[in-house]
């Protein structure tokens, strides 16, 4: 048999071999495919079948518009003008090219040694779906999992049966000071049919900087609080990416999962104490915020606030 | 909305002719499969012609066959049934379908023209 | 030519009750059959579409079915305004076939 690719919406003529140009003809064209259940044959004289699937006068067969329940196998036996059967076996299968993929939502630059989306791929219309590719600096980016990530997801149009690619690519750059090009490709992996490759981006890579400090922030402020309050304790840092932040209270670190506000709901004196919170980035190591002091006091009674001066005169330091 | 209205229904005398139309409205005319189903007093349905949306392929069943003729003018969004050498049995109801290709069946109908072969 | 043979020609039936309708086709026509409800006075209405596909604006109480060349419409619970005549066509041969029609009265 022979194999056929035909557009999607373009029409088709498959020639019925050995068939006589025009009649008296005898000919029989059968049908396989999503609009059939078995083999359907046609009648040479025509009927409700001609819309998608027509004996013309020369025997050949008119597909008028292929669709995607067109692919199958389509055969015709015919009698030659010597009286020997001819037959002819076709497999169709059709695709439709995507319009251009794109870049959506590609980054502005890309930080060293920690992981950056790159941005995502989508293609939009193919069939049959087809793959997207990621390239670096025009060479092919293979994913490892661990410094080249990809997510894909795959969406079929419920009716036109049309697929929608895409692709997430996630990296982790060695070193700053570089300007890699990125740049995705979709190919439908049909023979003679070159991918359609997006515009590339290029990309600053910089290495992480240093947090810019490491602020400590406690409400309420000056960290005076009735018992059976709620003390909020937010670590404020400028880096990126936000590093893991853990906590210290009287310089021993607390037993919890890494957040950068710490909540001390319902207090009590055994919450008492001088805390402050320990930043970790993957580069620069662990910083520290200055401390702050927690004080729990009957309502009415409160003490002067850290750093403030009492009615004796002098400078008090919790 | 789609719409189909027939009209050129009325009384003829056997042997006679008439020409039925069938103005259509709320839909790409030119995209479908037109047909004409007929409907006797008090009985079934029964298929009288087809053409497909360009107007080139015409169907009709034996009992029509050389007598009626069905075509189209896209142009007008129009459908039209020639009708000769009309005999007593071909007295019905009329009705204008839009489809009757395998991709839609008869999927809108017109109201129907009644067509009355008496002498 | 395809025969559609449709039984039974007359039903009759309560509000409320399950009813169902068969045509038999002579031959293969593989899914290409409509269903049409049609009142006194008017113009077939398509219930069903390719033997099992509901309309548009048709009331989930019509169903279609097929196994093999038996086709069988269904209404789950019958409805005063479901009281008509049901037509089955076959759509994938020339000439189209219509069944002989069921009529559905009240009991």
């Known amino acids: 048999g022979q194999n056929i690719t035909a557009r999607i919406g373009e029409p088709l003529v498959l020639s019925c071999k050995g068939a006589p140009k025009k009649p008296p003809q005898q000919l029989e064209w059968k049908l396989n495919t999503g609009r059939t259940e078995a083999w359907k044959v046609l009648s040479p004289q025509g009927g409700p079948w001609d819309s998608v699937a027509r004996i013309l006068p020369n025997g050949s067969l008119l597909l008028p518009a292929t669709g995607i329940v067109d692919e199958g196998t389509f055969r015709c036996r015919a009698t030659n003008r010597r009286g020997k059967e001819v037959k002819s076996n076709y497999r169709v299968r059709v695709y439709q090219i995507p319009g251009k993929p794109e870049i959506v939502d590609p980054a502005s630059e890309l930080t060293a040694s920690v992981p950056n989306k790159v941005g995502t791929c989508v293609s939009e219309g193919s069939y049959p779906a087809g793959t997207l590719s990621w390239h670096l600096d025009g060479k092919l980016l293979i994913p490892d999992g661990k410094e080249t990530l990809v997510k894909e997801e795959t969406r079929r149009h419920p009716e036109t049966g049309l697929f929608t690619l895409r692709s997430e690519l996630t990296v982790i750059p060695t070193q700053g000071g570089t300007h890699p090009t990125f740049s995705c490709s979709f190919s439908l992996g049909l023979p003679r049919r070159r991918p359609l490759n997006t515009a590339p981006i290029q990309l600053r890579v910089r290495e992480p900087g240093p947090p810019e400090g490491i602020q400590l922030l406690v409400e309420p402020e000056g960290g005076i609080v009735a018992p059976g309050g709620t003390v909020t304790l937010t670590c404020a840092i400028s880096a990126q990416p936000p590093p893991q932040v853990h906590w210290i209270k009287d310089g021993a670190p607390l037993p919890l999962a890494p957040s950068p506000v710490l909540l001390l709901p319902e207090v009590g004196h055994e919450d008492e104490g001088t805390y402050s919170c320990v930043a970790t980035h993957p580069s620069h190591g662990p910083q520290e915020s200055p401390p702050v002091s927690i004080r729990v006091t009957e309502t009415g009674d409160e003490g002067p606030a850290e750093g403030s001066v009492g009615e004796s005169g002098l400078g008090t330091l919790a | 909305e789609v719409l189909l209205v027939e009209s050129g229904g009325g009384l003829v005398q056997p042997g006679g002719s008439l020409r039925l139309s069938c103005a259509a409205s709320?839909?790409?005319?030119?995209?479908?499969?037109m047909t004409w189903v007929r409907q006797a007093p008090g009985k079934g349905l029964e298929w009288v012609a087809s053409?497909?949306?360009?107007?080139?392929?015409?169907y009709y069943p034996d009992s029509v066959k050389d007598r009626f003729t069905i075509s189209r003018d896209n142009a007008k969004n129009s459908l039209y049934l020639q009708m000769n050498s009309l005999r007593a049995e071909d007295t019905a109801v009329y009705y204008c379908?839009?489809?009757?290709?395998?991709?839609?069946?008869?999927?809108?109908w017109g109201q129907g023209t009644l067509v009355t072969v008496s002498s | 030519d395809i025969q559609m043979t449709q039984s039974p020609s007359s039903l009759s039936a309560s509000v409320g009750d399950r009813v169902t309708i068969t045509c038999r086709a002579s031959?293969?026509?593989?899914?290409?059959v409509n269903w049409f409800q049609q009142k006194p006075g008017k113009a077939p209405r398509r219930l069903i579409d390719?033997?099992?596909n509901l309309a548009d604006g048709v009331p989930s109480r019509f169903s279609g079915s097929r196994s093999g060349t038996d086709f069988t419409l269904t209404i789950s619970s019958l409805q005063p305004e479901d009281f008509a005549t049901y037509y089955c066509?076959?759509?994938?041969?020339?000439?189209?076939?219509f069944g002989g029609g069921t009529k559905v009265e009240i009991k």
């Open positions: 066509l076959e759509f994938d041969e020339h000439p189209l076939t």
């Open positions: 379908a839009r489809g009757g290709d395998i991709t839609t069946g008869f999927d809108y």
């Open positions: 053409i497909d949306n360009s107007g080139d392929n015409t």
């Open positions: 709320g839909f790409t005319f030119n995209n479908y499969w």
């Open positions: 031959q293969d026509v593989g899914i290409y």
């Open positions: 390719r033997a099992t």
